[in-house]
Interface confidence: medium
């Protein structure tokens, strides 16, 4: 790596990928192995994110880009650049402090995460249920009941009260 | 970091259709549900509906059904809306957001795209 | 599903405190804890302030805060300060299939 010969700041023409070196008279010298800086004029290098146990590495770290980690089968990403594993749960449950629990009456899921979401009310729109719902479907809506033929009913669930998992007001 | 990016302004003719796009990268597409919102000049903000990214299951505001169509390509981490017999009252700014939940709490819309103006003129 | 309700404007000095209200309905805002308030300024996308009714997302100022009584939601935004100015909406999750609906909008003057 050549000496920067900046009249200014000598570490600002160190490239990504290395550091100013300030033990060898501010020369540019590459990042150590797990390490990396992503711009230029750097006068350390991070360190990379190492992704272990519940993490598997999604990207290796380079000398210029950190390593960037997703989770292993059977759990999912939260947060920024996937800070969390989370567990994932079956289509029809949402994950609480309990571990995964059904979706209550009323609500469905057709996630292996997030949270349990109450049925469309169909009667809000004014149209009836044309398919029901289930833990891992919402309902159909269908036409309003008055567009039905004689005779014809429906049912339609009550909304649940709040949605599981969060506190009661 | 999460990034929505949508793409980029359109002029329609009355009766036209507009298909807006939204490609979404920082975080897992299909794990959370991609809303769209519109905005009229001057005005507030509207819900259109949602999309599962995984499922490729969709609601729409009810206002809006018959005309939009949501859809997805998860490989390519991108959410569409499309908006057909376009009349002068849907010139708006359309955005695509993100539903998210953690841990802590559900969000509703978080992070939003920039925004795409949707100008319909004959 | 019609649009929550909203004043339309609402101002202060700054370092005073101003409250924002939000009515809606039980099939939305009474019934869930799923309140959303959102700060747009112009030309650009809103961005989230309060979620769960009271809770703020990292990066926002605790100077703004969100409770709920019954079918009405509110925004407090205490100390006042010049960026603050801008439009303020209120969302809900509803039981309808028009799943998420917002406030008619509130514009925030500093004075």
């Known amino acids: 790596f050549e000496r920067t010969r900046s009249l200014q700041d000598p570490c600002s023409n160190c490239p990504a990928g290395t550091f100013c070196d300030n033990n060898r008279n501010q020369i540019c010298s590459p990042c150590p192995p797990n390490s990396f800086s992503s711009a230029g004029g750097q006068r350390t290098c991070d360190i990379c994110r190492q992704c272990k146990g519940v993490f598997r590495t999604r990207k290796e770290c380079s000398s210029t880009s950190n390593a960037e980690c997703d989770c292993t089968p059977g759990f999912h990403c939260l947060g920024a650049g996937c800070s969390m594993c989370e567990q994932d749960c079956k289509q029809g449950q949402e994950l609480t402090k309990k571990g995964c629990k059904d979706c209550c009456f009323g609500t469905f899921n057709d996630q292996k995460r997030g949270i349990c979401r109450p049925w469309t009310n169909c009667s809000l729109d004014g149209k009836s249920v044309l398919v029901n719902g289930t833990k891992e479907r919402d309902v159909v809506c269908g036409p309003s009941p008055a567009d039905l033929s004689p005779g014809a009913s429906s049912v339609t669930p009550p909304a649940p009260a709040r949605e599981p998992g969060h506190s009661p007001q | 970091q999460v990034q929505l990016v949508q793409s980029g302004t359109e002029v329609k003719k009355p009766g036209a259709s507009v298909k807006v796009s939204c490609k979404a990268s920082?975080?897992?597409?299909?794990?959370?549900?991609i809303h769209w919102v519109r905005q009229a000049p001057g005005q507030g903000l509207e819900w259109m509906g949602w999309i599962n990214p995984n499922s490729g299951g969709t609601n729409y505001a009810q206002k809006f059904q018959g005309r939009v169509t949501m859809t997805r390509d998860t490989s390519i981490s991108t959410a569409y809306m499309e908006l057909s017999r376009l009349r002068s009252d849907d010139t708006a700014v359309y955005y695509c957001?993100?539903?998210?939940?953690?841990?802590?709490?559900?969000?509703?819309?978080?992070?939003w795209g920039q925004g795409t103006l949707v100008t319909v003129s004959s | 599903q019609s649009a929550l309700t909203q004043p339309p404007s609402a101002s202060g000095s700054p370092g005073q405190s101003v409250t924002i209200s939000c009515t809606g309905t039980s099939s939305d805002v009474g019934a869930y804890n799923f309140v959303s308030w959102y700060q747009q300024h112009p030309g650009k996308a809103p961005k989230l302030m309060i979620y769960?009714?009271?809770n703020r997302p990292s990066g926002v100022s605790n100077r703004f805060s969100g409770s709920k009584s019954g079918n009405t939601a509110s925004l407090t935004i205490s100390g006042l300060q010049a960026e603050d100015e801008a439009d303020y909406y209120c969302s809900s999750y509803t039981s309808s299939s028009t799943r998420w609906v917002f406030g008619t909008g509130t514009k925030v003057t500093v004075l």
């Open positions: 769960d009714v009271s």
């Open positions: 957001a993100r539903d998210y939940y953690d841990s802590s709490g559900y969000f509703g819309p978080d992070y």
């Open positions: 920082g975080y897992t597409f299909t794990g959370y549900y």
